[in-house]
Interface confidence: low
């Protein structure tokens, strides 16, 4: 059995007697230290039980320089095997060995969990020579131990290319429970079960877990770590934490808020960024997401016009970016715009509605009843039309654009004329005789030029040949 040296143990008396922590198994290794030695360990631990078999590596020297006398096997003396202490305490432990004086330049190194301890560690090696042997004590001290100091420590010494290894000294640093997994904040659906996990470790073990909801314990009996708490469902926000208990005391995890998912708050600050004749670019500031990510948003558009049927156009868009270009709108129209966004729970209320207007656009219909005839006496072409019939104007009519194309013997020439908005007739000079003139007319607003009417053709004869018959396009419904 391993003797546990607890921190309450009294320091082992150094003098007189054998080396501290040594195990006396044969009489050849007995050695008394000189009483004048200034060596005084800060904390020593009681020796292991006599008679314990030695399991470390042993170096067996062959002969002395004289070649006659056999030397005993070299081995570290047994020392305390297991040290248990609390975090932030100081500890000092050692290993010792008696080495015949024929060996020179012996060095002892310390190893922890298979790795050599180098650098800024408090390791001291002291030598106590006698007639035939030198007692070597290697001490290792740690101030304010931490959990990371837990592990198995050994001494190693090299002699004649042989390696001598001591028994391990197990350091166990005990303290309050240490969380390896704490509960995490969650957003959950109302009245839906969910799990929280808490895990803590010692030493010392075992670690027991209590769950706390809104400052009240959930479980009367503790659960061994790790613990999973299944919450059947919540109707309102709650704060959970877990308490981890061991023999040293208790540690409390961070409190985590469990939020209940709800529909989002409505967006705010709907703003107009750009208007054209048929589109409006808007942006908005999303409302609170109700503890559930936004999925998409809906832009709702109502035409503010006594003549409109009051229907709402709905445009669905992604939740991000918080921007949308509303298209396919009427020119020179007023609209009321609202935005609503949804998460997995449902749709928010609509944002405060804002007013926006589209700018003037080009007309959407062409002039009607385009009639063309030749006034040969004046050598010009007379054109007549009707104002485009439309339920609503795309903008204020500023005039008409007349396209007349003259085709003769493979040559084609297009000319454009502009006339004012009050005109419904125009005259254009004959450009070429013995040719075809094709006329089209479009309405014009500040927003642009509308579509051209269907082409009307008239043949312009050579001089002296008259045809007074007009050419025309019929009005809609009269064809």
């Amino acid at each position: 059995a391993i003797t546990e040296a607890r921190e309450e143990a009294k320091p082992y008396p150094l003098f007189p007697g054998p080396l501290p922590g040594s195990l006396q198994t044969d009489h050849t290794s007995l050695l008394s230290l000189p009483h004048t030695s200034g060596y005084q360990p800060a904390l020593m631990f009681s020796p292991t039980q006599p008679g314990r078999p030695y399991t470390g590596n042993v170096a067996i020297p062959r002969v002395t320089s004289a070649g006659s006398k056999l030397l005993p096997p070299l081995a570290f003396k047994h020392t305390v095997g297991h040290i248990i202490l609390s975090e932030h305490k100081d500890v000092k432990f050692n290993c010792s060995i008696s080495v015949p004086n024929i060996y020179q330049d012996t060095t002892i190194s310390w190893w922890k969990d298979g790795k050599e301890l180098l650098g800024a560690h408090h390791a001291i090696t002291q030598f106590y020579p006698d007639d035939e042997v030198t007692a070597i004590i290697a001490s290792f001290s740690i101030t304010s131990v931490q959990r990371s100091d837990n592990g198995s420590y050994i001494c190693k010494m090299k002699i004649n290319n042989e390696e001598i290894v001591s028994d391990p000294i197990y350091i166990e640093v005990q303290g309050l429970p240490h969380f390896t997994k704490q509960p995490e904040s969650m957003n959950v659906t109302r009245n839906t079960a969910f799990n929280l996990t808490c895990q803590a470790v010692g030493p010392p073990e075992p670690v027991n877990i209590f769950w706390v909801q809104n400052s009240s314990r959930v479980n009367e009996q503790p659960e061994k770590s790790p613990s999973v708490l299944t919450v059947p469902g919540l109707t309102e926000m709650a704060v959970f934490s877990c308490e981890a208990h061991n023999d040293k005391g208790l540690t409390v995890s961070k409190g985590v808020q469990i939020n209940i998912k709800a529909i989002p708050s409505p967006p705010t600050e709907v703003s107009i960024h750009n208007s054209t004749a048929h589109s409006i670019l808007i942006s908005w500031v999303p409302g609170f997401d109700g503890y559930s990510p936004f999925r998409n948003c809906s832009v709702q558009v109502k035409e503010v016009d006594p003549l409109s049927n009051g229907s709402v156009m709905i445009f669905n868009t992604s939740a991000s970016p918080h921007m949308y270009q509303i298209k396919q709108l009427q020119a020179l129209a007023n609209y009321s715009i609202g935005v609503s966004c949804m998460n997995e729970i449902g749709w928010s209320a609509v944002s405060p509605w804002i007013l926006a207007s589209t700018t003037e656009g080009a007309p959407s219909v062409a002039p009607l009843n385009v009639t063309v005839f030749l006034n040969e006496s004046r050598d010009n072409v007379d054109i007549r039309w009707m104002k485009p019939l439309t339920k609503r104007q795309a903008g204020e009519l500023v005039g008409y654009r007349i396209s007349h194309v003259w085709q003769s013997a493979g040559i084609s020439k297009e000319l454009l004329e502009e006339v004012g908005q009050n005109n419904s007739r125009a005259q254009i000079s004959v450009q070429v005789h013995n040719a075809t003139c094709t006329v089209r007319i479009a309405a014009v607003t500040k927003g642009g030029v509308g579509p051209f009417s269907d082409p009307v053709k008239i043949f312009i004869p050579a001089h002296g040949w008259v045809d007074h018959a007009p050419s025309s396009t019929p009005a809609p419904g009269n064809a």
């Epitope: 703003s271 107009i272 921007m323």
Partner: antibody
Framework: QVTLRESGPGILQPSQTLSLTCSFS??????????VGWIRQSSGKGLKWLAH???????FYNPALKSRLTISKDTSKNQVFLKIANVDTTDTATYYC?????????????WGQGTPLIVSS | DIVMTQSQKIMSTSVGDRISVTCKAS??????VVWYQQKPGQSPKALIY???YRYSGVPDRFTGSRSGTDFTLTISNVQSEDLANYFC?????????FGSGTKLEIK
């Protein structure tokens, strides 16, 4: 650390085309919501917004100057460019480029030091 | 275009005083207004955005408010380093427009 630096010709003659470059560091125009704009400041007229380009290559111009302005970017080189065609003496000003981060709100949080332009025959 | 009017061209104040710089928008712009400070020989720096939110690193003696389309930048306990030009800007719609600026002089 976000920095912007404007560069330009300094002096131009009327009817020439002004080419400005904004070189920036500390952010990328590949990032969602990022944008860079141009603003000019003339001694008599205060600050005037000229144009803005967004991460997704959306461009917006001041309508009063739109026919003369062209904004563009080279994302890989962290540069934004502005061209103003057919300059005249009223274009004499200090030209700033500035950054908008995150889309909304649309305010310029970092500005360059400005590059002066004098248009003179 | 939305016109931002800063009627006070120059304001004179003393260290420790409280002063209000005003800006009026010609149309509704919501809270989409930012205030910039421009010290002599420097480029503008954002002070207050969305009408009342201080930009990071701006001392809390700078505050912003609005009433309808009237926007106010208030500097309480004026310091000598506050000598600068102050501009408002709306970003409710394109084109973004600036006020003409108010120059703060320290007596």
């Amino acid at each position: 650390q976000v920095t912007l630096r404007e560069s330009g010709p300094g002096i131009l003659q009327p009817s020439q085309t002004l080419s400005l470059t904004c070189s920036f560091s500390g952010f990328s125009l590949n990032t969602f919501g990022m944008g860079v704009g141009w603003i000019r400041q003339s001694s008599g007229k205060g600050l005037k917004w000229l144009a803005h380009i967004w991460w997704d290559d959306d461009k917006f111009y001041n309508p009063a100057l739109k026919s003369r302005l062209t904004i563009s970017k080279d994302t890989s080189k962290n540069q934004v460019f502005l061209k103003i065609a057919n300059v005249d003496t009223t274009d004499t000003a200090t030209y700033y480029c500035a950054r908008i981060e995150g889309g909304l709100p649309y305010y310029y949080d970092y500005w360059g030091q400005g590059t002066p332009l004098i248009v003179s025959s | 275009d939305i016109v931002m009017t800063q009627s006070q061209k120059i304001m004179s104040t003393s260290v420790g005083d409280r002063i209000s710089v005003t800006c009026k928008a010609s149309q509704i712009v919501g809270t989409n207004v930012v205030w910039y400070q421009q010290k002599p020989g420097q480029s503008p720096k954002a002070l207050i955005y969305s009408t009342s939110y201080r930009y990071s690193g701006v001392p809390d003696r700078f505050t912003g408010s609005r009433s309808g389309t009237d926007f106010t930048l208030t500097i309480s306990n004026v310091q000598s380093e506050d000598l600068a030009n102050y501009f408002c800007q709306q970003y409710n719609s394109y084109p973004f427009t600036f006020g003409s600026g108010t120059k703060l002089e320290i007596k």
